[in-house]
Amino acid sequence: APVRSLNCTLRDSQQKSLVMSGPYELKALHLQGQDMEQQVVFSMSFVQGEESNDKIPVALGLKEKNLYLSCVLKDDKPTLQLESVDPKNYPKKKMEKRFVFNKIEINNKLEFESAQFPNWYISTSQAENMPVFLGGTKGGQDITDFTMQFVSS
């Protein structure tokens, strides 16, 4: 079944942008001016998820790349990775659970909770130029709040 999708960029609550760091990693850093063109454009898709009152299940692909953010166990720890997929089959309504994030939207701030690992969130560090990761704490040092910007074609 077809899915609703949109093109967007994400910035953390400190206004750090997300950029590629090697082929399979994202990092967060402050960008200005022409450097803003480096930021990753996501294709965010509305997918099937578990019933909830305030969480909207989405998948986060990299626009025009066959890469999706996914959550897997590595060394017994929930880990965020970029995973290659067959572009003929993605996005789809019934995404595998590792690709699904519960989007929580409050006052124009977004959180992305892993559907595979509840209470683990897409996170950035306070420090500059550090990897985007899956964090198990909210409201601590690490940043779990983001803003979304539609991308004009």
Epitope: A1, P2, V3, R4, S5, L6, N7, C8, M44, F46, Q48, E51, S52, N53, D54, I56, V58, K93, K103, E105, N108, T147, M148, Q149, F150, V151, S152, S153
Partner: antibody, heavy 119, light 108 residues
Framework: EVQLVESGGGNVQPGGSLRLSCTAS????????MAWVRQAPGKGLEWVGI???????YYASWAKGRFTISRDNSKNTVYLQMNSLRAEDTATYYC?????????????WGQGTLVTVSS | EIVMTQSPSTLSASVGDRVIITCQAS??????LSWYQQKPGKAPKLLIY???TLASGVPSRFSGSGSGAEFTLTISSLQPDDFATYYC??????????FGQGTKLTVL
């Protein structure tokens, strides 16, 4: 005050075209998903379509090809371009903001603008 | 496409009555269902989303329930301001969004 105001409605002949506008005040439309919903006189609500970023628009099956939704963030305005209009397109057209991205429901609505297709 | 069917189409009741309106989806939509109230000449007003969550500012006499394909809107004690037309809406159906045909609630 946060509000949406539609304009551009009026009388048009069958086969004609019309462009409706929906202008936001009190908030920025630039990162809001905006939909159009219509209601024929004495009838129920009918979803027309929705726009996210300017390249991501979705339409009811009956609206595809004739109706186009677009946006101009600099004017804080969303548009509904309607072509090849028919008598059955006579309706009040509402714009509405999606409550949260992909929530599919609409908490903020305009007052509506009436389109009459008649010769 | 998913079709939403409301019943009854019209309903007469009195102030203080408990009123139940039902909405059936042609296939499962989990809890992706909203309810709206509309008064003549006015825009619709969101009452309930995700089947059971009350929208901001909506009185607690309104409640929603259901999941899958069967849903209900209940008004526990009808007030004079509640006479209006009510619509259900499927909010999670792929790329399209569908409304029910409406239920007109009138004074008995």
């Amino acid at each position: 005050e946060v509000q949406l105001v539609e304009s551009g409605g009026g009388n048009v002949q069958p086969g004609g075209s019309l462009r409706l506008s929906c202008t936001a005040s009190g908030f920025s439309l630039s990162n809001s998903a905006m939909a159009w919903v219509r209601q024929a006189p004495g009838k129920g609500l009918e979803w027309v379509g929705i726009i996210y970023d300017s390249a991501s628009t979705y339409y009811a099956s009956w609206a595809k090809g004739r109706f186009t939704i677009s946006r101009d963030n600099s004017k804080n305005t969303v548009y509904l371009q309607m072509n090849s209009l028919r008598a059955e397109d006579t309706a009040t057209y509402y714009c509405a903001r999606e409550r949260a991205i992909f929530s599919g429901d609409f908490a903020l609505w305009g007052q509506g603008t009436l389109v009459t297709v008649s010769s | 496409e998913i079709v939403m069917t409301q019943s009854p189409s019209t309903l007469s009741a009195s102030v203080g009555d408990r009123v139940i309106i039902t909405c059936q989806a042609s296939q499962s939509i989990d809890n992706w269902l909203s309810w709206y109230q509309q008064k003549p000449g006015k825009a619709p007003k969101l009452l309930i989303y995700r089947a059971s969550t009350l929208a901001s500012g909506v009185p607690s006499r309104f409640s929603g329930s259901g999941s899958g394909a069967e849903f209900t809107l209940t008004i526990s004690s009808l007030q004079p301001d509640d006479f209006a037309t009510y619509y259900c809406q499927n909010t999670g159906g792929g790329v399209s969004i569908a409304f029910g045909q409406g239920t007109k609630l009138t004074v008995l």
